[in-house]
């Protein structure tokens, strides 16, 4: 998935200013492209450091520029290099003196395994003096002064991978800066073969692309694209996409493009020379003007893309005739994606006339991993794969790139890939309160590892030894009803964010018990006052069938201070409970269970006061309504926490003495109304209630007056006493 | 592995002939120059010839040339050196040696036969 | 023919010192020239080719220089193993030429 392309404008060095520009088309490396001087080469050569610099017309690449008196530093073999995966692809170049004595028929030869190969350089400057050849450096070959031919030839029969290298020519007198260059790339199998063992056929590369032995694949010429190199780009374009754009004047004239071996150096299509500033004359084109054009109905060639075929006909010459090919287009993806950590299945979808086919189609990961679809698909007008990554993780994030390479051309979409870690809690949920059916649980979803937004919560629970169960969960603090009692049971909360896939790991796991199912409370509770500062709590003997021991547990609290509460432990034996230390005048709220090993269930609560310190009150509210000629109501109302155990009311007829009063004593303290009976008709009376406590009597301010009315008429004649 | 094994040598009276063949393994013979180097009892290395066996080119040292002749069967993967004419001064250890690709330096060499012309 | 002259023909030294031979090439031979090791009944190894190039398994310790007509072999640290006879070559032209030898013994 690196497309990496190296210009050297120019290798035959003058006094012009040269440069070296590494390009990684279409691709986001992670690690720096670097270019230097390739001492495997050539180990004598300059030593200075190169300055590389970026290229700011291009998003990924850099460049080595040599000011016009650096010249005579430049001479030697050069490298780029981008890093995928671990591996180095290395792209390599020469430079030389243009006046050098002698200059090589090309940059680069790519030939075959077995091939019988002719590296030949010309003789331009003439010396009486004998011709020396090298192999990267290493002597290889010398030919006498007065036997230096005007073309100085290396034969290689049966060429090997072994003899690839760096081949110089230079008279014997000269130096490294006076030699030519010229490499030799041997591809590790035979023509048209590819494979480790070399016994697969290559697709049949057009317009001189160069067949990959490790890969199968085409490396197409700067100008031309697609699985077969069949697709010519625009004019001045290149890359294996033809995204890249020739900046000069006349296009990519004076640009040699270096591809990764097997393909080597060439001009771009249209263009021939050592130099790559010769236009190709009429009736060639391509890289080098190697090839040309043969068009099957006289239809014009252009030096750039060849036979330009007129409407219904296609092919390189022109021989086909059918629908018109139309380069891929990559449909409906998205610059940026959001994923989930996990399994992902992402999606290329591409159009284009023929279809592209499942292998025609990869997805390449940041790191430069290639993937092929597991799933594919195509409609009348589209091609879908689909791919699987078991497990993506955050540092698969980053620019992917879908990928659709057929013989009607080659188009990459890059797109940007967010993988986000699952959320998961770092704490275990807490166990606020449990019973023998329920627990009340705070879920602690934070802190929590790994990214938001929380979408939801789930709430995982089961008995130990049995299947998890969960509830999807809003809040912190939640309630988990219909519990089995007595029964062990784990907690994990899990935690889910946005997208597919989006629900973490479940977070650590809390272990808790439910209770027994309790004992009744006791029966036949009563709670009375004992004294100022004691009250008694008295029940029914308690009956269990369970073995075990048990007691009863009281718990008491204060109405007016609700802190002041007390848990007091009873002998399972015993009936009652003396509550002592109490304050008085105070309400005391009181329930009781009965506990085994487990707790039993509360009672009701029951309420009471201590007895009083202080007289009570006057009863309130005094009313005396519904007179008659012997009745009146008497009515009132009494200050709750006084101990009142009776009222007393006390009435007499005016002007008698104080001694012929008559008392009623109420001793329910509950009654509030009383009906006085017997009274004589049209008396006045003197009326006084009291409250009447532990202490005594309160003290009443007033006496009511009252008169009752006369008697009415007898109409039978004659009273009637009842 | 690269492998180069000698064999013919023995005891010759001077004017006889003798025929050593080396047998080559391991690389690819014709892609390669096989020479033939010999060492005097006590004394140096010189060379004798050599041969390129895709094309048949052959070199010879001075003193043996007209009597000596080296060829190259790329069937077998084996050189000879027929050596007629022999004298006392040719009694030698006969090496025979791959150049490799370029008729430089020796890069492989046989164990050495061993010939001697006595009368 | 173009001559090979090795000094010096025989040399002591112990082990770990640094020993150098010297060839010169009867004219300009550019770097064409190997330096091989021969032990006793042995056929030679080559150590050096093209003057500089120190080939494939040999130790470096084994180093060699020189262009045009002077050569060197050095041996910067002389291992008991090294102990042999020592020989320079051109293939500058045919036919390639050998030096006499340089005999390093144990002193």
């Known amino acids: 998935a690196m497309d990496l392309i190296l210009i050297n404008s120019l290798p035959l060095v003058s006094d012009a200013e040269t440069s070296l520009t590494c390009i990684a088309s279409g691709w986001h490396p992670h690690e720096p492209i670097t270019i230097g001087r390739d001492f495997e080469a050539l180990m004598n050569q300059h030593q200075d450091p190169l300055e590389v610099t970026q290229d700011v017309t291009r998003e990924w690449a850099k460049k080595v520029v040599w000011k016009r008196e650096k010249a005579s530093k430049i001479n030697g073999a050069y490298f780029c290099e981008g890093r995928v995966r671990g591996q180095a692809i290395r792209i390599r170049t020469m430079k030389m003196r243009q006046q050098a004595s002698f200059l090589p028929a090309t940059l680069t030869m790519t030939v075959d395994r077995g091939d019988n190969v002719n590296i030949s350089f010309k003789k331009v400057l003439i010396k009486e003096e004998d011709a020396v050849i090298y192999k990267n450096g290493s002597f290889i070959h010398s030919v006498p002064r007065h036997e230096v031919p005007d073309i100085l030839e290396v034969h290689l029969p049966h060429a090997q991978p072994q003899d690839a290298g760096v081949y110089s020519a230079r008279y014997i007198g000269g130096n490294l800066f006076t030699s030519a260059f010229t490499r030799l790339i041997v591809r590790r199998c035979e023509a048209q073969k590819w494979g480790p063992d070399c016994n697969r056929p290559c697709t049949t590369c057009k317009n001189n692309g160069v067949c990959h032995e490790d890969t199968g694949e085409c490396i197409c010429p700067p100008g031309f694209m697609g699985r077969t190199c069949e697709k010519a780009c625009e004019p001045h374009t290149f890359g294996r996409t033809c995204k890249e754009r020739c900046s000069g004047s006349e296009g990519c004239k004076s640009y040699v493009f270096c591809l990764p071996d097997p393909y080597g150096c060439s001009c771009a299509t249209g263009w021939r020379g050592l130099q790559c500033n010769e236009a190709c004359p009429y009736g060639h084109y391509g890289p080098d003007c190697k090839l040309r054009c043969h068009c099957t109905n006289e239809e014009m060639c252009d030096r750039f893309q060849g036979c330009l075929c007129s409407q219904g006909w296609q092919g390189l010459q022109c021989e086909k005739e059918g629908r018109p090919r139309m380069t891929p287009q990559i449909e409906d993806l998205p610059d940026h994606i959001e994923v989930n950590s996990g399994k992902f299945n992402p999606i290329c979808k591409a159009s284009g006339w023929p279809l592209p086919t499942s292998e025609e189609m990869t997805l390449v990961k940041p790191d430069g991993t290639v993937l092929q679809p597991n799933d594919f698909n195509h409609t009348d007008h589209f091609s879908v794969a689909i791919f699987t990554v078991n497990r993506i993780l955050p540092p698969d994030s980053g620019v992917w790139v879908c990928s659709v390479n057929t013989v009607a051309g080659m188009v990459e979409k890059p797109f940007n890939i967010s993988v986000k870690v699952l959320p998961e809690p770092l704490h275990a949920p807490n166990v606020i309160d449990t019973g023998h059916n329920f627990a009340i649980i705070n879920i602690s979803s934070e802190p929590y590892f790994g990214d938001g937004p929380i979408k939801s919560k789930k709430l995982f629970y089961k008995p130990v030894n049995q299947a998890w169960k969960y509830i999807q969960v809003m809040n912190e603090i939640v309630t988990l009803n219909y519990l089995e009692p007595r029964t062990d049971y784990e907690l994990c909360v899990q935690l889910v964010r946005p997208g597919e896939g989006g629900e973490g790991h479940p977070g650590p796991v809390r272990r808790f018990t439910t209770a027994s199912i309790g004992l009744p409370p006791p029966r036949g509770l009563s709670l009375l006052p004992k004294s100022q500062t004691a009250l008694n709590l008295t029940w029914q003997p308690i009956f269990t069938s369970s073995e075990d021991e048990f007691y009863v547990e009281v718990e008491r609290w204060s109405q007016q201070t609700r802190s002041d509460q007390q848990n007091i432990k009873v002998p399972g034996n015993l009936t009652s409970v003396l509550l002592n230390n109490l304050l008085p005048r105070e309400q005391y709220s009181v329930r009781a269970r009965v506990n085994t090993k487990a707790q039993g269930e509360w009672s009701e609560e029951l309420r009471a006061w201590t007895l009083s310190d202080i007289l009570p009150p006057q009863p309130e509210n005094i009313k005396i309504t519904n007179i008659t000629d012997y009745t009146a109501l008497v009515s009132w109302t009494i200050v709750d926490g006084y101990s009142i155990s009776s009222i007393i009311i006390r009435y007499k007829v005016q002007g008698k003495n104080e001694d012929q009063h008559i008392d009623v004593k109420i001793k329910n303290a509950t009654i509030t109304q009383y009906q006085l009976k017997g009274l004589e008709p049209e008396t006045t009376y003197h009326v006084d209630i009291f409250a009447e406590n532990n202490i005594g009597s309160s003290n009443p301010a007033f006496s009511q007056e009252i008169r009752t009315l006369p008697a009415p008429k007898d109409l039978g004649g004659g009273k009637m006493l009842l | 592995e690269v492998q180069l094994v000698e064999s013919g040598g023995g005891l010759v009276q001077p004017g006889g002939s003798l025929r050593l063949s080396c047998a080559a393994s391991?690389?690819?013979?014709?892609?390669?120059?096989i020479s033939w180097v010999r060492q005097a009892p006590g004394k140096g290395l010189e060379w004798v010839a050599r041969i390129n066996p895709y094309d048949g080119n052959t070199y010879y040292a001075d003193s043996v040339k007209g009597r000596f002749t080296i060829s190259a069967d790329t069937s077998k993967n084996t050189a000879y050196l027929q050596m007629n004419s022999l004298r006392a001064e040719d009694t030698a250890v006969y090496y025979c040696a791959r150049n490799n690709r370029f008729p430089t330096w020796f890069d492989y060499w046989g164990q050495g036969t061993l010939v001697t012309v006595s009368s | 023919d173009i001559q090979m002259t090795q000094s010096p023909s025989s040399l002591s030294a112990s082990v770990g010192d640094r020993v150098t031979i010297t060839c010169r090439a009867s004219?300009?031979?550019?770097?064409?020239v190997a330096w091989y090791q021969q032990k006793p009944g042995k056929a030679p190894k080559l150590l050096i080719y093209s003057a500089s190039f120190l080939y494939s398994g040999v130790p470096s310790r084994f180093s060699g220089s020189g262009s045009g007509t002077d050569f060197t072999l050095t041996i910067s640290s002389l291992q008991p193993e090294d102990f042999a006879t020592y020989y320079c070559q051109q293939s500058y032209t045919t036919p390639p030429t050998f030096g006499q030898g340089t005999k390093v013994e144990i002193k």
């Open positions: 391991g690389f690819t013979f014709s892609g390669s120059w």
């Open positions: 004219q300009d031979v550019s770097t064409a």
